[in-house]
């Protein structure tokens, strides 16, 4: 006869009750809220009332765990999902309800991923509004333009020129360089951070740009810009199906019509619609290359990235990988391929899944040339697939509100207690940094900051010159020896130039997979 181990109790199905429920309707932590559809009573050992089965034990209902991505969490345990914290309570996740930062990206030569997650292809060859808050009747505060050259046809010469107009300033990103073409009126919250493969620009409290020094540009916005932006990046309203809203407020079906509407100058020709299957960017005319590209790009859905695939949809990046790698003029140049895989790995890292995907033969990256002693550098540079993005250095002496958790690339490693002087490329004691201290904060050499901006009585503009601090009242423009400011440059200035040299990459790909 059936005997049960306590605290389980024996249930024998009654022969006279066809609707009785038995072992087949055992309540578990995972099915507790589901109704049972019994196809016939099964006798066996059940948990006593007030308890449910979990793995092979009986547990009190309030001791049931929660589940997230196949992992079990005990009551009271927390997980971070995006920018929200969730606590396990009564078998359910109880989460905070913050609107997270939103990221819009240009990926590769011609793909865009909007703030709301819509991916589309637009191989435009003009200058376009990537994102701005000059939308409808809004009095805007910033505009980011992107100009493409050589990005609409198979080429390794694709270059993007990004123009950032904010706070009266103009900053240009092009060919791996940052040019401050006009300083911002208030540089208090302006920082240029070089970190690994990336350059991160902090452009105020709610706007930042992350650039891989080549074709990948991400604009990160805080919640304050929700539903206030427009351009190729969409409108950050949480809804994907209105992301292709043109500059004249039409929701377009075709990304080409949408993209053309955000052109800065009407003198630049509209992009024409080309059926994708006849585009050279799908390798349709080169079966050998197509097979090679397909199998290489599959790394994105292979075991290497399997943990990340559960969190970040690889499909947009797979499309970009195939398009861009096919677009590269020769199979030997895998920069297009490597950049796309790196872009996906970067997003994975931001979601807490660090993937070490580079190998000695697949897009290798070394930092050894930065460790050459004859360069006189006194800190060790090491490759890291996920190192803190905005570290404290002499040039950034205070912790920064970094838009990304970590970045890959070559990073300086200093002995404990020392920090990097980026200028001298050496590790120094923090007190040896050329900084100015004011109001309990440390400012890097060259920084111009506004103190007490909302208090006209005490408002000051302070300038840290190496270690000498000079301050002046906000309303008095005198003080520093500055020549007259040049006339503002029109943001719509078109550039036309012959770019003949191939883009630079600090890694190579010895072969595709």
């Amino acid at each position: 006869s059936l005997s049960c181990r306590p605290p389980m109790v024996k249930l024998v199905c009654p022969a006279d009750n066809l609707r009785a429920e038995g072992l087949e309707c055992t309540k578990t932590c995972q099915n507790y809220d589901l109704e049972c559809m019994s196809m016939g009573c099964v006798s066996g050992c059940l948990c006593p009332p007030g308890m449910v089965r979990h793995e092979n034990r009986c547990v009190a209902l309030e001791r049931c765990p929660c589940f997230h991505q196949g992992k079990e969490y005990a009551p009271g345990e927390t997980v971070k999902i995006g920018c929200n914290t969730c606590v396990c309570q009564d078998r359910k996740w109880n989460c905070t309800d913050h609107v997270c930062d939103a990221t819009c990206s240009t990926i590769g030569m011609a793909h865009y991923l909007t703030f709301d997650g819509l991916k589309y292809l637009f191989p435009g060859e003009c200058q376009y509004v990537l994102v701005q808050d000059y939308c409808g009747s809004n009095p805007g505060t910033f505009r980011i333009l992107v100009g493409n050259k050589g990005c609409s046809h198979p080429s390794v010469k694709c270059k993007k020129r990004v123009t950032i107009l904010v706070e009266g300033g103009e900053i240009e990103l092009f060919d791996g360089e940052v040019n401050v073409k006009r300083p911002m009126k208030d540089e208090t919250h302006f920082e240029v951070v070089e970190s690994g493969r990336y350059i991160i620009l902090l452009l105020g409290k709610a706007l930042s740009v992350v650039w891989d020094r080549h074709l990948s540009i991400s604009v990160v916005l805080k919640q304050t810009y929700q539903e206030k932006v427009c351009g190729l990046c969409g409108n950050f309203d949480g809804i994907q199906n209105n992301d292709l809203t043109s500059s004249n407020l039409q929701v377009e079906e075709d990304p080409v019509d949408f993209g053309n509407s955000w052109k800065v100058s009407s003198q630049c020709a509209d992009t024409r619609k080309v059926p994708l299957d006849s585009s050279p960017a799908t390798c349709h005319n080169n079966i050998m290359k197509q097979t090679m590209v397909d199998s290489s790009c599959r790394i994105l859905t292979s075991d290497v990235f399997q943990d990340c695939n559960k969190l970040v949809d690889p499909e947009p990046y797979l499309d970009v990988c195939i398009y861009d790698t096919c677009s590269c003029e020769s199979i030997g140049d895998c920069a297009c391929f490597c950049d796309t895989i790196a872009a996906y790995a970067h997003v994975c890292a931001q979601h807490g899944k660090v993937v070490t995907w580079r190998t000695a033969t697949l897009c290798p990256q070394s930092c050894e040339e930065r460790n050459l002693r004859e360069n006189g550098y006194e800190c060790e540079w090491r490759y890291n697939s996920c190192a803190p993005a905005c570290q404290v250095t002499c040039q950034h002496p205070e912790p920064l509100a970094c838009p990304v958790q970590c970045v890959e690339g070559c990073h300086a490693h200093c002995p404990p207690g020392k920090i990097l002087d980026e200028l001298l490329q050496t590790c120094v004691d923090p007190e040896d940094c050329p900084v100015c201290e004011v109001a309990g904060r440390r400012f890097a050499s060259g920084k111009k900051v506004t103190l007490n901006p909302s208090d006209p009585e005490h408002c000051q503009i302070c300038h840290c010159d190496v270690v000498n601090l000079t301050c002046e009242a906000c309303q008095e423009p005198g003080g520093l020896v500055v020549p007259p400011t040049d006339a503002p440059v029109s943001p719509t200035t078109l550039y036309v130039e012959d770019i003949s040299e191939p883009p630079l990459h600090d890694f190579y790909c010895s072969r595709l997979l």
Epitope: V481, V482, P483, P484, T485
Partner: nanobody, 128 residues
Framework: QVQLVQSGGGLVQAGDSLRLSCAAS????????MAWFRQAPGKEREFVAA????????YYADSVKGRFTISRDNAKNTVYLQMNSLKPEDTAVYSC?????????????????????WGQGTQVTVSS
């Protein structure tokens, strides 16, 4: 604070070369990014070239790329502008400028408002 004293300049023929120097006072020269600007009569001040504190790479206006070279000697507290294949349109007053702002190894400012200290200016005239 730094004082900048310029030398060089003068009258040359088209196709000739000329070198401008800009000497800085003070012991912290290495902490300053340096640049050259020029202003032709009746025109706005124009960016010519810049070299960051680290001196690793330099930046040029399209109009002088391949002809002009900016360099610095931190031991001598001096920045130079070597001008080759000079053209009549290079005629201007050339000024060196300094800022202690460090934007990074791959960043610079091409705007005069990004610089805090200026040399006295030196005339370069290129005749055809």
């Amino acid at each position: 604070q730094v004082q900048l004293v310029q030398s060089g300049g003068g009258l040359v023929q088209a196709g000739d070369s000329l070198r401008l120097s800009c000497a800085a006072s003070g012991r912290t020269f290495i902490r300053y990014a340096m640049a050259w600007f020029r202003q032709a009569p009746g025109k706005e001040r124009e960016f010519v070239a810049a070299i960051p504190q680290s001196g690793g790479r330099s930046y040029y206006a399209d109009s002088v790329k391949g002809r002009f070279t900016i360099s610095r000697d931190n031991a001598k507290n001096t920045v130079y502008l070597q001008m080759n294949s000079l053209k009549p349109e290079d005629t201007a007053v050339y000024s060196c400028a300094a800022t202690s702002t460090y934007y990074g190894r791959s960043a610079y400012s091409s705007h005069s408002g990004g610089y805090d200290y200026w040399g006295q200016g030196t005339q370069v005239t290129v005749s055809s």
